[in-house]
């Protein structure tokens, strides 16, 4: 059974992941640039199901494309430093999903824009955090 300290650690990691995703979405929503239109043309794979920590495998597999899209957005008004940001998210995701079990991610048929993708994973984090508090 998970201990109180392990639950607290999981909750803090999920809160950090949530904040990182919210920071990206906020940066994109603030973005007044022709590049935004182009960013929205990139398609992301969405998980068929995302209800457990193991499903973060689906997020991990989309981190490289996410970094590429964020690199496109780099400018003096975009302060997210994609390499550092994605590296941070990657570390959190690896810790949260664990490496013991190999989970094959199943994706939905429909792809999504970066905004839909971020909102999906933000909702995922919020829903898991809610079960922990």
């Amino acid at each position: 059974a998970p201990t109180s300290s392990s639950t607290k650690k999981t909750q803090l990691q999920l809160e950090h992941l949530l904040l990182d995703l919210q920071m990206i979405l906020n940066g994109i929503n603030n973005y007044k640039n022709p590049k935004l239109t182009r960013m929205l043309t990139f398609k992301f794979y969405m998980p068929k199901k995302a209800t457990e920590l193991k499903h973060l495998q689906c997020l991990e597999e989309e981190l490289k494309p996410l970094e590429e899209v964020l690199n496109l957005a780099q400018s003096k008004n975009f302060h997210l430093r994609p390499r550092d940001l994605i590296s941070n998210i990657n570390v959190i995701v690896l810790e949260l999903k664990g490496s013991e079990t190999t989970f094959m991610c199943e994706y939905a048929d429909e792809t999504a824009t970066i905004v839909e993708f971020l909102n999906r994973w933000i909702t995922f984090c919020q829903s898991i955090i809610s079960t922990l508090t």
Partner: antibody, heavy 113, light 107 residues
Framework: QVQLVQSGAEVKKPGASVKVSCKAS????????VHWVRQAPGQGLEWMGI????????SYAQKFQGRVTMTRDTSTSTVYMELSSLRSEDTAVYYC??????WGQGTLVTVSS | DIQMTQSPSSLSASVGDRVTITCRAS??????LAWYQQKPGKAPKLLIY???NLETGVPSRFSGSGSGTDFTLTISSLQPEDFATYYC?????????FGPGTKVDIK
């Protein structure tokens, strides 16, 4: 539990910049993301943005985009908020807050010619 | 951006009174709501997080309820040290936004 200590009051002229510091002690510096919130005299609370102290990346409220820069120095466990092109409406108390549950004491910035 | 409104904007009450402050979000924020208390010249102090969870060290006379768009902060028996301004704040999405505040003063 982390404690946050902010730099002292500042008086600035319109058009100038101000840099407010927020030093953390008592807990791991990178444990909590740091928000900056300001409060004009007699007014409510206004969120300015957030910085991840470990990664050093930040995200800002649209209102301050292009005028605010949040940075950090991990060697001194300090985060900074710099606001440029100051105008009289920027006169306020500026707070840093770790995870929005531990707050610094506030720094009064007065913008006056 | 999510707009937060509070009512009343101010109220006068006596020690021992039960006080209720309401907060409304312009769109659903689940339970991603916090309540703060602020006294003049001081930083805000977190009272309630996740709509109903009491922050460590906060007296049990404070309680929070609600979800979606409507939230309530209740002080079951007002104490002299509770005269202050109270703010709600949503953390469902960025930018983080605060309510305009409710000032509780002595009747």
């Amino acid at each position: 539990q982390v404690q946050l200590v902010q730099s002292g009051a500042e008086v600035k002229k319109p058009g100038a910049s101000v840099k407010v510091s927020c030093k953390a002690s008592g807990d791991t510096f990178t444990r909590h993301y740091v928000h900056w919130v300001r409060q004009a005299p007699g007014q409510g609370l206004e969120w300015m943005g957030i910085i991840n102290p470990s990664g050093g990346y930040a995200s800002y409220a649209q209102k301050f985009q292009g005028r605010v820069t949040m940075t950090r120095d991990t060697s001194t466990s300090t985060v900074y908020m710099e606001l440029s092109s100051l105008r009289s409406e920027d006169t306020a108390v500026y707070y840093c807050a770790a995870g929005l549950f531990i707050w610094g004491q506030g720094t009064l910035v007065t913008v006056s010619s | 951006d999510i707009q937060m409104t509070q009512s009343p904007s101010s109220l006068s009450a006596s020690v021992g009174d039960r006080v209720t402050i309401t907060c409304r979000a312009s769109q659903s924020i689940g339970r991603w709501l916090a309540w703060y208390q602020q006294k003049p010249g001081k930083a805000p102090k977190l009272l309630i997080y996740s709509a109903s969870n009491l922050e460590t060290g906060v007296p049990s006379r404070f309680s929070g309820s609600g979800s979606g768009t409507d939230f309530t902060l209740t002080i079951s028996s007002l104490q002299p040290e509770d005269f202050a301004t109270y703010y709600c704040q949503q953390a469902n999405s960025f930018p983080v936004t605060f309510g305009p505040g409710t000032k509780v003063d002595i009747k």
